[in-house]
Amino acid sequence: IFKKEQAMCLEKIQRANELMGFNDSSPGCPGMWDNITCWKPAHVGEMVLVSCPELFRIFNPDQVWETETIGESDFGDSNSLDLSDMGVVSRNCTEDGWSEPFPHYFDACGFDEYESET
């Protein structure tokens, strides 16, 4: 399942790059799989929010991206995730790349990596 989620993530990132016109030389933060969940590409200044992953949920590669990007266009969007909710983790896209997750996964989600033994 871990490998499958990673593969699905890379697929999603590729599709998002095409939609957003991202390439290797684009400024901003590349999409990434951080060994826990999937982060879509973002522009500098954007905050991306994700829900805590369900550990053994199998991704549907055709579903909409499960993160929300907070930019000016997203303000007031009642469908977007909210950092004031529990079980939500954010990263900022800065000129130096992705920030650390906030809160840390262990505090927001109750775990901080997929276990090597299950």
Partner: antibody
């Protein structure tokens, strides 16, 4: 019924190492659901979380920055207990020290506590 | 570190009273907040976690509310065994800081 039983000396000299042990019954230090924490309480600093150890396929620790350079929390799987070591103590480390189990349900909380050990740092 | 403050620092009340204790965080903590009760010479006891979920075995006269930076613990119909000190604790960022406590004593 989870119970935590603390043991260790109540008097430690300045610059020495404070060592306390917390024996677990009704649960295991190797539980994949729990964390095992140390907290202290003094009139000057109130309740202060110090750190935790936990097992998720491998052992991990998180420590409070205020004591990070001086603290070690170690599990002992053979006895299902965990220990606190605080090095280079000063009188400011005088406090009641508690061990506690952390559990997760939407957030981490401390649901079972040891009885507390008053540790005085004095020469 | 996130600073947790509580008000009042102490209050006097009578059996049967309804009391409210406030806890404020120095930055938003969503609902990552716990409440504990402590009696003299004893360890703290968990009452409420995640802002408003009652711990198993805790009487329903205790309730928690709030989100973000402002939280309240309410005790409806105060009982003799409720005279104690109450602490809030944020559970979102290491170190997991506690409030200074609110002492509830008999009027």
């Amino acid at each position: 019924q989870v119970q935590l039983q603390q043991s260790g000396p109540g008097l430690v000299k300045p610059s020495q190492t404070l060592s306390l042990t917390c024996a677990i019954s009704g649960d295991s230090v190797s539980s994949r659901q729990a964390t095992w924490n140390w907290i202290r309480q003094s009139p000057s600093r109130g309740l202060e979380w110090l750190g935790r150890t936990y097992y998720r396929g491998k052992w991990k620790n998180h420590y409070a920055v205020s004591v990070k350079s001086r603290i070690t929390i170690n599990p002992d799987t053979s006895k299902s207990q965990f220990s606190l070591q605080l090095n280079s103590v000063t009188p400011e480390d005088t406090a009641v020290y508690y061990c506690a189990r952390g559990m997760w349900q939407g957030n981490w909380f401390l649901d079972h506590w040891g009885q507390g050990t008053l540790v005085t740092v004095s020469s | 570190d996130i600073q947790m403050t509580q008000s009042p620092s102490s209050l006097s009340a009578s059996v049967g009273d309804r009391i409210t204790i406030t806890c404020r965080a120095s930055q938003s903590i969503s609902r990552y907040l716990n409440w504990y009760q402590q009696k003299p010479g004893k360890a703290p006891k968990l009452l409420i976690y995640a802002g408003r979920i009652l711990q198993s075995g805790i009487p329903s006269r205790f309730s928690g509310s709030g989100s973000g930076t402002d939280f309240t613990l309410t005790i409806n119909s105060l009982q003799p065994e409720d005279f104690a000190t109450y602490f809030c604790q944020q559970a979102i960022i290491n170190p997991y800081t506690f409030g200074p406590g609110t002492k509830v004593d008999i009027k």
